[in-house]
C-alpha cells in the first residue's frame, strides 16, 4: 500500500495494452461495479445501520487482552539496548514484523529512511572539568552511569549525552539559571542584571523540554550548557534509589535530544521524506540544531560544580533545589576558588543513519480507505523499561488481540494501521518521515491517530490528552472499563479517574488535557490535522512534584523497575491497553464516527475567553490600536450553533443510507483538518493547527490559540508597539477566519 514508487508488473503490462482495450475494460468494470453497489445497497445487514459497535466484538477484543502477555512482551523488548540507528534496533524491527504477521495482520512492512542522528565518540568521551589557574583538571564528571546489577556485561550502553550537541571545549565561569525557562532568564537578565554572555550555564532538568532550555541559553549568549537532575525534581521523598526503589541515584543521568525542530522531522530534509533521492541540506542549514555544546550530568557531579558557586544569591526559594549547596547564581566560583573555571569536553558526532519503521495493516471490510492509526516508538536510549517498551508491549498485545479476532473471521469496518516508529528519541523522526512520505493519503483518509509511547509514568490514575472530538469517546469507554485502582474494586475506570483527577471546570468529570508535543502524534495532529489522542497511567501530581518519573532516560529504566516497583501485576498496563485498544476499536468500527463536534465548541469558547483575558491586561493599548475580539467571539458563536445543528442531524439521519453515512462521517473526519492553516504559524511552518500548538516556551505543553498567544507574549517589551499590536490583530483575524471556516464544514451540504 505504501510503496508508491514501485511499479508492479501488472501496471507495466497495462501500459503496453491498446487504448481501446483499456477503455472497453473500464466500461465493463464500471457496469459490474454499479450492479454490485446496488446489490450491496439492498442486502445491507441491519447491524450496519446502527451506531453501536456490536458489543460481543468489543467485548471479545477487550477480553483477549492479557496482563501476562504484556509482561512477557516487555521483558522480551528490554533485555538489550535498542538505540535508534543500531543493529539491535533493526533486529527488533524485524522481530516485530515477523510477530505481527504471525498475529494475523494482512501485511507488515519495514519502511526505512536515512536521517541525521547523533552519537558520542567511542574513543573520545564527553565530560566536564573544573580546572585550576594552571589549566589542570582538578575534577571531572563521570564518563558513564554505573550499570545496574545484572547488566554489568551488557555491551553498547550509550553513555549519557545530549543528542545533537555540537563539538566544542568551551571554558569559563558558571552561571546557575534554575530551569532555564523563559521566565528564569527574564529574572536573571532583567531583574538581577546578570549577563550570561560568554558563560557556561548550568540548568536543572524539569518543567520544560530540554531543547527549550538550550534555545534560551543560546539566546542569552551562553557558550555552553550543563543540564543536571536535581533531587528536588527527581528524588521523591521517602523512596529509595534504584535498585532498592524507583528514585534516581546520584550517578543517574537523563539522556535526550536538544533540538528545536518545531515539527520539521529529519533536520536535513524538512517537509519531505528522507529517502534515497531526497535533497539534503548542509549541516549549517539543518533545522533546529543547537549552536553551543551541551552535556547532562547526575546530581553527585552537579554537587561538585554547584558547591563552589559564588556571585549573587538565588533570588528566592523557587530557585533552590535539594542539594546541600548554596544555589548561588554566580557568575563564577566563590572566594578561594574564584580562579577556577569550568571546561566542557564534547566530541559527539552527527551522522546520516538508516532507521526503520514497522507498519502493519489490518484492512477494513467496509471503508478500507479510512485509516485509524495506532503508533508508538520502538527506539530507546538504553533498555527502555518504561520509555518506550511499556508502550510497545501494549501495542504488541493490542495487535495480537485484533489478530485473534481476524483469524476468527472478524474485520474492522475501517482499516487499522499499526506502527512501530524508530528514532522518536532523536526528534520524532520515524513517524514524521513516514507521515511526510504518505501525507497525501493521510490528509484524505486519516480518521484518527492514537499514540502509544510509555504506558505508565506512575501508578496513581489515568491521564489522557486528546482532541476535544474524542472527549465523549474517552468518557464513554472509561465508563465501560473496570478500574484497576485499590479501593475502587468493582467500580469503573471513569469513577476512579474522576475522583483522583477531577476536571477543573466540570464537576463529576475527569480532567483531559490539551495535546502538546514531544511525541509521535505531533506530525499527525499539529501538521496534518488528524484527530489524535494519547492515554497512560500517571502519578499523583498533587503529592509528587518531581518532573516526569525519576529514572526517565537513564540506564536504570529497566524491566525490573516496572516489575518490582511500578506495576508488579501489570494491571495498569492492561488498563492502558484497554483504553488505547478500545479507542482504536471504536474509531475503526463505529458506524458513525465517535466524534462530538459540540465539545470543540465548548473549548473554543473557553480558549477565546482565556486569550481575551490575556489581552485585556493591556487595556490602553487595545484601545489605542483598536484591538477587538468581537469577530472571534462571533465565529465561536457561529461554530457552536452550527455544531449543535449538525449533532441533531447526526442523531436523526438515515444510517442505512451509505452515501449519507459517508457524507456525515467525512464532515466529522475533516473537522480537525479544517483547523489547519496551510501557511503554518509564524516562523513555525510545520505547526499548522490554529487552535493548538506546542508552547513556544515548552514543547511538551499545548497552547491554545498559539498565534495570538505568541503575538501577545511579552508584548510590553517590544520595541515597536504599533507593529506588535498589528501582529496581534492579524492573528485574531486568522483565528476568526479558521473557526468560521471550520464551522462551515459542518453546515448542511445542500
Amino acid at each position: 500500500m505504501w510503496n508508491l514508487l514501485h511499479e508492479t508488473d501488472s501496471a507495466v503490462a497495462t501500459a503496453r495494452r491498446p487504448r481501446w482495450l483499456c477503455a472497453g475494460a473500464l466500461v465493463l468494470a464500471g457496469g459490474f461495479f454499479l450492479l454490485g453497489f446496488l446489490f450491496g445497497w439492498f442486502i445491507k445487514s441491519s447491524s450496519e445501520a446502527t451506531n453501536i459497535t456490536p458489543k460481543h466484538n468489543m467485548k471479545a477484543f477487550l477480553d483477549e487482552l492479557k496482563a501476562e502477555n504484556i509482561k512477557k512482551f516487555l521483558h522480551n523488548f528490554t533485555q538489550i539496548p535498542h538505540l535508534a540507528g543500531t543493529e539491535q534496533n533493526f533486529q527488533l524491527a524485524k522481530q516485530i514484523q515477523s510477530q505481527w504477521k504471525e498475529f494475523g495482520l494482512d501485511s507488515v512492512e519495514l519502511t526505512h529512511y536515512d536521517v541525521l542522528l547523533s552519537y558520542p565518540n567511542k574513543t573520545h568521551p564527553n565530560y566536564i572539568s573544573i580546572i585550576n589557574e594552571d589549566g589542570n583538571e582538578i575534577f571531572n564528571t563521570s564518563l558513564f552511569e554505573p550499570p545496574p546489577a545484572g547488566y554489568e556485561n551488557v555491551s553498547d550502553i550509550v553513555p549519557p549525552f545530549s543528542a545533537f550537541s555540537p563539538q566544542g571545549m568551551p571554558e569559563g565561569d558558571l552561571v546557575y539559571v534554575n530551569y532555564a525557562r523563559t521566565e528564569d532568564f527574564f529574572k536573571l537578565e532583567r531583574d538581577m542584571k546578570i549577563n550570561c554572555s560568554g558563560k557556561i550555564v548550568i540548568a536543572r532538568y524539569g518543567k520544560v523540554f530540554r531543547g527549550n532550555k538550550v534555545k534560551n541559553a543560546q539566546l542569552a549568549g551562553a557558550t555552553g550548557v550543563i543540564l543536571y537532575s536535581d533531587p528536588a525534581d527527581y528524588f521523591a521523598p521517602g523512596v529509595k534509589s534504584y535498585p532498592d526503589g524507583w528514585n534516581l541515584p546520584g550517578g543517574g543521568v537523563q539522556r535526550g535530544n536538544i533540538l528545536n525542530l518545531n515539527g520539521a522531522g529529519d533536520p536535513l530534509t524538512p517537509g519531505y521524506p528522507a529517502n534515497e533521492y531526497a535533497y539534503r541540506r548542509g549541516i549549517a542549514e539543518a533545522v533546529g540544531l543547537p549552536s553551543i555544546p551541551v552535556h547532562p550530568i547526575g546530581y553527585y557531579d552537579a554537587q561538585k560544580l554547584l558547591e563552589k558557586m559564588g556571585g549573587s544569591a538565588s533570588p528566592d526559594s523557587s530557585w533552590r533545589g535539594s542539594l546541600k549547596v548554596p544555589y548561588n547564581v554566580g557568575p563564577g566560583f566563590t572566594g578561594n576558588f574564584s580562579t577556577q573555571k569550568v571546561k566542557m569536553h564534547i566530541h559527539s558526532t552527527s551522522e546520516v543513519t538508516r532507521i526503520y519503521n514497522v507498519i502493519g495493516t489490518l484492512r477494513g471490510a467496509v471503508e478500507p480507505d479510512r485509516y485509524v492509526i495506532l503508533g508508538g516508538h520502538r527506539d530507546s536510549w538504553v533498555f527502555g523499561g518504561i520509555d518506550p517498551q511499556s508502550g510497545a508491549a501494549v501495542v504488541h498485545e493490542i495487535v495480537r488481540s485484533f489478530g485473534t479476532l481476524k483469524k476468527e473471521g472478524w474485520r474492522p469496518r475501517r482499516t487499522i494501521l499499526f506502527a512501530s516508529w524508530d528514532a522518536e528519541e532523536f526528534g520524532l523522526l520515524g513517524s514524521t518521515e513516514w507521515a511526510e512520505e504518505n501525507s497525501r493519503l493521510l490528509q484524505e483518509r486519516g480518521v484518527a491517530y492514537i499514540n502509544a509511547d510509555s504506558s505508565i509514568e506512575g501508578n496513581y490514575t489515568l491521564r489522557v490528552d486528546c482532541t476535544p472530538l474524542m472527549y465523549s469517546l474517552v468518557y464513554n469507554l472509561t465508563k465501560e472499563l473496570e478500574s484497576p485502582d485499590e479501593g475502587f474494586e468493582g467500580k469503573s475506570l471513569y469513577e476512579s479517574w474522576t475522583k483522583k483527577s477531577p476536571s477543573p471546570e466540570f464537576s463529576g468529570m475527569p480532567r483531559i488535557s490539551k495535546l502538546g508535543s514531544g511525541n509521535d502524534f505531533e506530525v499527525f495532529f499539529q501538521r496534518l490535522g488528524i484527530a489524535s489522542g494519547r492515554a497512560r497511567y500517571t502519578k499523583n501530581w498533587e503529592t509528587n512534584k518531581f518532573s516526569s518519573y525519576p529514572l526517565y532516560h537513564s540506564v536504570y529504566e529497566t524491566y525490573e523497575l516496572v516489575e518490582k516497583f511500578y506495576d508488579p501485576m501489570f494491571k495498569y498496563h492492561l488498563t492502558v491497553a484497554q483504553v488505547r485498544g478500545g479507542m482504536v476499536f471504536e474509531l475503526a468500527n463505529s458506524v458513525v464516527l465517535p466524534f462530538d463536534c459540540r465539545d470543540y465548541a465548548v473549548v473554543l469558547r473557553k480558549y477565546a475567553d482565556k486569550i481575551y483575558n490575556i489581552s485585556m491586561k493591556h487595556p490602553q493599548e487595545m484601545k489605542t490600536y483598536s484591538v477587538s475580539f468581537d469577530s472571534l467571539f462571533s465565529a465561536v458563536k457561529n461554530f457552536t450553533e452550527i455544531a449543535s445543528k449538525f449533532s441533531e442531524r447526526l442523531r436523526d439521519f438515515d444510517k442505512s443510507n451509505p452515501i449519507l453515512l459517508r457524507m456525515m462521517n467525512d464532515q466529522l473526519m475533516f473537522l480537525e483538518r479544517a483547523f489547519i492553516d496551510p501557511l503554518g504559524l509564524p516562523d513555525r511552518p510545520f505547526y499548522r493547527h490554529v487552535i493548538y500548538a506546542p508552547s513556544s516556551h515548552n514543547k511538551y505543553a499545548g497552547e491554545s490559540f498559539p498565534g495570538i498567544y505568541d503575538a501577545l507574549f511579552d508584548i510590553e517589551s517590544k520595541v515597536d508597539p504599533s507593529q506588535a499590536w498589528g501582529e496581534v490583530k492579524r492573528q485574531i483575524s486568522i483565528a476568526t477566519f479558521t473557526v468560521q471556516a471550520a464551522a462551515e464544514t459542518l453546515s448542511e451540504v445542500a
Partner: nanobody, 125 residues
Framework: QVQLVESGGGLVQPGGSLRLSCAAS????????MHWVRQAPGKGLEWVAF????????YYVDSVKGRFTISRDNSKNTLYLQMNSLRAEDTAVYYC??????????????????WGQGTTVTVSS
Amino acid sequence: QVQLVESGGGLVQPGGSLRLSCAASGFTFSSYGMHWVRQAPGKGLEWVAFMSYDGSNKYYVDSVKGRFTISRDNSKNTLYLQMNSLRAEDTAVYYCAKGDYDFWSGYPDYDMDVWGQGTTVTVSS
C-alpha cells in the same frame, strides 16, 4: 558476601617497582569508587589513592604523586596500584577499600565500608 583480596606485595629495593592488585567480589564493582590505604609499622592509617567507579577521577596523597598510579579493570572486577620509585617510607601494609557511597565520581571525601586483609610491601636494601 562482599570480599576484597589484595595481592602483589613483597620485598623490593629502594627505587624499585611493584604492582598491587585487589580482586573484588560480592558487589557491583563497576558502581563504586575504590581506595588504597596503607598502615606503616607503628603508625596510623594513611589514605593513598582513590579512583572513581568509571575512572574519570583519580586522587593521590601528595607524598606519592608522580610515583604511584591507581587503575582499575571493571571487566575483571580488579583494582590496581602501580608503585614506582619506591622509598623506605613506603613500607606498609596496603589495603584496598570500597567507597561507601554508591555511584560517586567525586572527591575521596567520605568513609570506606569494606576493607581487604592487606598485602605487605617492604622497601629495603
